[in-house]
Each structure stands twice: as structure tokens, then as C-alpha cells.
């Protein structure tokens, strides 16, 4: 009191940092720094992030909050989790769609667009892996269908149709001449 020496940064508890003259307690997540503390080991003046902004971590220096991202509708993105004061919007793809990364080295923050998942049923194939982070992985042809070229062809319903070897093996028909 009344002295001139600045106090050392040896405040009780953690998360104090020198801001200007004094060691100040930082602002909690979801709050920005309005004014640093004005006395040794004091609390800074922190205000809650306004709507549509956030700060995910405790901090000593952010004088404004980050703007929440908007999901890219052009890329068919949807908000999986809405923005809060402590977390950004989490964008992703709606059910039945998967993330297609726009860069080769894909990380969580990489730009992406959403692609509709392959419908194995429409291709007359078993679903081997459900579509989520990548496209659906389709398996072998459904019963009543056989592999022909790249697709599954329906087994002939009568003995009149031709039934190649693979067809015969799957459909149980002998080749008829």
C-alpha cells in the first residue's frame, strides 16, 4: 500500500499471468477480457461472449470472442451442434450423406462437402460398412442377383433366359440350350 515496487507473479492458485503491471487471473472459457486486473493477483473484468461468438479456452488476452462459423449450405453441410459461448458450431453431414474432404491431407478443420451415400440396396448389393465418415462399402449381390460386369443382375425367372456360369452358380439354374 502506497509503495512503488510491482508485486512478483506469485499469486495463490494457477492461471495468473502478468498483464501490464500486475499478475491477473484470466477469463474463463466463454468470456472475453474487458479490462485487465488493476491490482496484484486480481481478477480481470471478463464479459460473456455475445450471441454467435465463442471462446473455447481460458485466456488472458482475448479482448473479443471469435465469430461462430456458419455451415456451408452450398456444400450440403448441416450443424451437428449449434455454437455456444464455449464451442464453435460443429458442421457435418446429415444422415445418408458423408464427408468428402476438399484437400488431400484431411484434418478436422479441412474444408469439406457432403456427398449422398451410396444406396447398396438400390444396387442390389449387401451393405458391408454403413456410410458415416466415408462412403458406404457395398458387398456381394443380394440373394436372387448375380455378379455381371460391374453390377448385379437379377436371376432369370424362367428357364427361357440364358444363365451364364456365375448365374448358374448363384441362381441355381443350369444353362439351357
Amino acid at each position: 500500500q502506497g509503495g512503488t515496487r510491482s508485486p512478483r507473479c506469485d499469486c495463490a492458485g494457477d492461471f495468473h499471468k502478468k498483464i501490464g503491471l500486475f499478475c491477473c487471473r484470466g477469463c474463463p472459457a466463454g468470456h472475453y477480457l474487458k479490462a485487465p486486473c488493476t491490482e496484484p493477483c486480481g481478477n480481470s473484468t471478463c464479459l460473456v461472449c455475445p450471441q454467435d461468438t465463442f471462446l473455447a479456452w481460458e485466456n488472458h488476452h482475448n479482448s473479443e470472442c471469435a465469430r461462430c462459423q456458419a455451415c456451408d449450405e452450398q456444400a450440403s453441410q448441416v450443424a451437428l451442434e449449434n455454437c455456444s459461448a464455449v464451442a464453435d458450431t460443429r458442421c457435418g453431414c446429415k444422415p445418408g450423406w458423408f464427408v468428402e474432404c476438399q484437400v488431400s491431407q484431411c484434418v478436422s478443420s479441412s474444408p469439406f462437402y457432403c456427398q449422398p451415400c451410396l444406396d447398396c440396396g438400390a444396387l442390389h448389393r449387401h451393405t458391408r460398412l454403413l456410410c458415416s465418415r466415408r462412403d458406404t462399402d457395398c458387398g456381394t449381390c443380394l440373394p436372387g442377383f448375380y455378379e455381371h460386369g460391374d453390377g448385379c443382375v437379377s436371376c432369370p425367372t424362367s428357364t427361357l433366359g440364358s444363365c451364364p456360369e456365375r448365374c448358374a452358380a448363384v441362381c441355381g439354374w443350369r444353362q439351357m440350350f
Partner: antibody, heavy 116, light 107 residues
Framework: EVQLVESGGGSVQPGGSLRLSCAAS????????MNWIRQAPGKGLEWITY????????YYADSVKGRFTISRDNAKNSLYLQMNSLRAEDTAVYYC?????????WGQGTLVTVSS | DIVMTQSPSSLSASVGDRVTITCQAS??????LSWYQQKPGKAPKLLIS???NLETGVPSRFSGSGSGTDFTFTISSLQPEDIATYYC?????????FGQGTRLEIK
Amino acid sequence: EVQLVESGGGSVQPGGSLRLSCAASGFTFSSYGMNWIRQAPGKGLEWITYISSSGGHTYYADSVKGRFTISRDNAKNSLYLQMNSLRAEDTAVYYCARGQGPFEYWGQGTLVTVSS
Amino acid sequence: DIVMTQSPSSLSASVGDRVTITCQASQDISNYLSWYQQKPGKAPKLLISDASNLETGVPSRFSGSGSGTDFTFTISSLQPEDIATYYCQQYDNLPITFGQGTRLEIK
């Protein structure tokens, strides 16, 4: 808009007293530390005293310690400097300034002349 | 007390010149240093804080650098309105202290 307006300057004889005021507006006065800085005619800047936002912590330069007292009234958004036992070398323009490190905002200053 | 030694004490330069002012602290002050501009009859104006952080609204021709004990203030291209006295100030420790100032004139 942040504004700081000093008043109370004038001429006084050595050994006399004077009380300076600084009226603050445009910001939450009670959130900020405040300072008095002076500048003798044709000379540089000299920080003389600081007060915390609550008024609970005060600091002084050796040149004024024991003679000057800084105080504040947050209800009135006002900062004060009580100057006693004035000397010729206290002649200066006195500025109030906001901040606890960098002085972000300054008043226009008020001149104090100590002369017999 | 921390002594701030500013140099030069005065300098004369032409419009468009690059101007550099230095400030030396008598002990390590990390980056707790500000630069102010003061025009005659006016209050000082904060230009730079934390050694290199340009204040909002301050033209980008002003810049600051340094850490520890040695600091530099630069005007990349001097303008007529930059004629003023410039001060460095440390706020690492109380008492807060200023450099003695650098008076900048146009040639």
C-alpha cells in the same frame, strides 16, 4: 467515446495545497486503474501515482510520496489528486490517464504553477 | 527504478524518409514497453503497446520491435503530420518510467 477532463489547476504559493479532479465518461470507470502523470514546462513525462479500480491499491513516485494523495469516487466517475506541501518543482501540466500499463486514454491536462 | 534511455534526443528528416528511434532499458522489461506521440500543446497519444502491438486507428507506417532491454520505433515513410515528440515508456515495474523523448522535425 472515452473522455477524461481535468480541472482544479491554477497558481499556488510554495507550501500550499491544491486538489485536482478528473471527470471520466464513455467507459466503465469502475473497471479501470487510473493514473496521474505530469509534465514540467519544456520537459518530459513523469508518472506520479496510480490507483486500482476499487481504490484499494495506490502507488506513488518517490518525488511525491507523503505529499500527494490519489483517490477516486466510482459513483461520480471521478479521480482526484490532493497535492499538499507544494514546491516550485511541482510546476507542471497534470494529466489523468487510464490504464495499468500502457496509458490508453489521456485527459487534455491542467496546469499547476507553484510560485511565490 | 528502471531508467529508459532514448536516442536520439532530436532528429530532422524529410517527408518520405524512414525514421528510427531507439530506447534502452536499464534492466530486462520483457515486452512491457509503449510508444507515445505528443504534439505541441496536446496530451500524449498511445501508438504502440507491448513493444510491437499497433493500437487501433494508428497508421501502419508506425511500428515497434524489440524485447528485453533494446527497443526500436520506426516510421516507414515520414509524413508532415508526424512532427511531434515521441516517448517510450516501460510498465514492467513500478514506478512507471518514460524515456526523455525524441523531438522529430521536418528538414
